[in-house]
Interface confidence: low
Amino acid sequence: KEVVLLDFAAMKGELGWLTHPYGKGWDLMQNIMDDMPIYMYSVCNVVSGDQDNWLRTNWVYREEAERIFIELKFTVRDCNSFPGGASSCKETFNLYYAESDVDYGTNFQKRQFTKIDTIAPDEITVSSDFEARNVKLNVEERMVGPLTRKGFYLAFQDIGACVALLSVRVYYKKCPEMLQSLARFPETIAVAVSDTQPLATVAGTCVDHAVVPYGGEGPLMHCTVDGEWLVPIGQCLCQEGYEKVEDACRACSPGFFKSEASESPCLECPEHTLPSTEGATSCQCEEGYFRAPEDPLSMSCTRPPSAPNYLTAIGMGAKVELRWTAPKDTGGRQDIVYSVTCEQCWPESGECGPCEASVRYSEPPHALTRTSVTVSDLEPHMNYTFAVEARNGVSGLVTSRSFRTASVSINQTEPPKVRLEDRSTTSLSVTWSIPVSQQSRVWKYEVTYRKKGDANSYNVRRTEGFSVTLDDLAPDTTYLVQVQALTQEGQGAGSKVHEFQTLSTEGSAN
């Protein structure tokens, strides 16, 4: 973009420039060119010896310009077209400038002016051209700067040429206001920062509802001395709730949202959300639906799962295998885990309580991903109720729970009560008892024994009676003895492990 400070041709002769010396040299004249009246300053003192004729412009306000461009259109006659070649004739003129903070009016002093250049024509107008009214127009441009004062004058020094100055245009260059990458760059004076830095770096302003991305570079462009924008750096992005439409950020339409500053468009509100208002940054979940903290806002809202399906409890002596299937309704999530809790009830008193501490699970029961678990170390003649709860990532956001229960009665025998009946140096006589009510269910008793400290081998004796003598034992040795009832359903409860010691060879029975 060019900002014109002075345009002689456009003023149609209304600019009264100062000539020096007064009444000699340069003169304003009107001519017809291409059927149009044109004004020009002309001088043609080619035979009068040395010339020093000055034409000074009016004072020109600099505005924001730091460097100005001066475009001259002129014509020069060929010195050879004058009688005798006019020995003092020249075919060039000089261009000067002077800066000032005030208009000096008619006070003209040559010493205040600095020479810009000698202006020479590319083409001169020879006699034949002149007679055919075919003048050769030359265009020359010069640049001046940096300027620092409020205004300036230009001056043209004639040193004996035949010249007509048809156009003097002074302008400076600006990079025009521009929208790029959602950033508005202001109209900027085209100025070289230095010889080594010919580009001015300009920061852009993000358009309404646009922001510089977090951790990103703000929008920058480079304004060249020629008034052209180059090398964009950084960008602005439409802020949350807004999307890019051409060079602007528009609020997300109702039913759409955008949760962060990004290049992406607004997204449609996901399933199970309420329709959003204009400019939404998120979509609220429908009643009964939720978002886990780690769920992206683009994900459908979900709900806790229903209870697990088809829970079964299969008793196996002192063990129970629990099996279930996944909930019918997963709540729209894949992150389902199961949690098993246990309650035991004494049939005689009807009293119940938790039993997590007394039973053993085949795997930790509070974040199960599989749909089965085995519970062991169950007590005999006890009623157990197991609850299996299904949970997902949003279960923690509601107070209700989704679980199914199954009950099982443990009918295995009570552990036998064992005592040492007799002993010798090589044998131990062991007896036991169980409640009479359970004796009919016992098929045999299994006695397991081994030397204390010997974990690698053990002996097993089976008997239908309530006693056994363990022979061939080592003297003065402690044995670990356990008795277990065997029923049709499998193994009953085992007694606690007892430590019994044979007599030493020197000792006597006690």
Epitope: A203, T205, C206, V212, G218, P219, C236, E240, G241
Partner: antibody, heavy 126, light 112 residues
């Protein structure tokens, strides 16, 4: 006309609660960050809390942290300050004031609090 | 005790020039944070007077000017008028504080 109007002040006993409101008109409040600033009788200005345009960033002065909660409803062009566990030293005129959104060109935070409400008085006394 | 220090009071005769200083530290003004100035006329809400160290919002007379240097800022009022009698507060930001916003203690300007 751009204006902010506070309401909800009054007399409350120590330990009590109050909720202040600030209604914005004449501009789109969702484009601006907002502040609460208070002024105890005969004293200077004390900044209380800040909330960004989308409520994604919230700050509190140490003196109110854990007791006061700032929030906003952009659909209603409203700003709120929930004040719990009030103390005698919370007695003041409470002003809401808007921030112009910082952006890269203006530099952060080139603009101050350019629009203020008329204030609402909170008195904490037994 | 305010993070930014202002003189409690200044005074001047009509037509005179007065300045109000605002002294901070390396974690606020000295860290490059902008300084804003507010005017609070008696019985009214504060009003933004100077923003971004030296910029005047529209409607603020050019008798008011702001500047900043190092860890300090100052507000200058030339051609003092009776209606300038008010409390003046500087405000900046402090990287060491929660929320960052800090005010000076305020300066009472009396027009003699």
């Amino acid at each position: 006309e751009v204006q902010l109007v506070e309401s909800g002040g009054g007399l409350v006993q120590p330990g009590g609660s109050l909720r202040l409101s600030c209604a914005a008109s004449g501009f789109t409040s969702s484009s601006y960050s907002m502040n609460w600033v208070r002024q105890a009788p005969g004293k200077g200005l004390e900044w209380v809390s800040y909330i960004s345009s989308s409520s994604s960033t919230i700050y509190y002065a140490d003196s109110v942290k854990g007791r006061f909660t700032i929030s906003r409803d952009n659909a209603k062009n409203s700003l709120y300050l929930q004040m719990n566990s009030l103390r005698a030293e919370d007695t003041a005129v409470y002003y809401c004031a808007r921030y112009r959104l910082p952006n890269f060109w203006s530099g952060y935070p080139n603009y101050g609090m350019d629009v203020w409400g008329q204030g609402t008085t909170v008195t904490v006394s037994s | 005790q305010s993070v930014l220090t202002q003189p409690p009071s200044v005074s001047g005769a009509p037509g005179q020039r007065v300045t109000i200083s605002c002294t901070g530290s390396s974690s606020n003004i000295g860290a490059g944070y902008d300084v804003h100035w507010y005017q609070q006329l008696p019985g009214t809400a504060p009003k933004l007077l100077i923003y971004g160290n030296s910029n005047r919002p529209s409607g603020v007379p050019d008798r008011f000017s702001g500047s900043k240097s190092g860890t300090s800022a100052s507000l200058a009022i030339t051609g003092l008028q009776a209606e300038d009698e008010a409390d003046y507060y500087c405000q900046s930001y402090d990287s060491s504080l929660s929320g960052h916003v800090v005010f000076g203690g305020g300066t009472k300007l009396t027009v003699l």
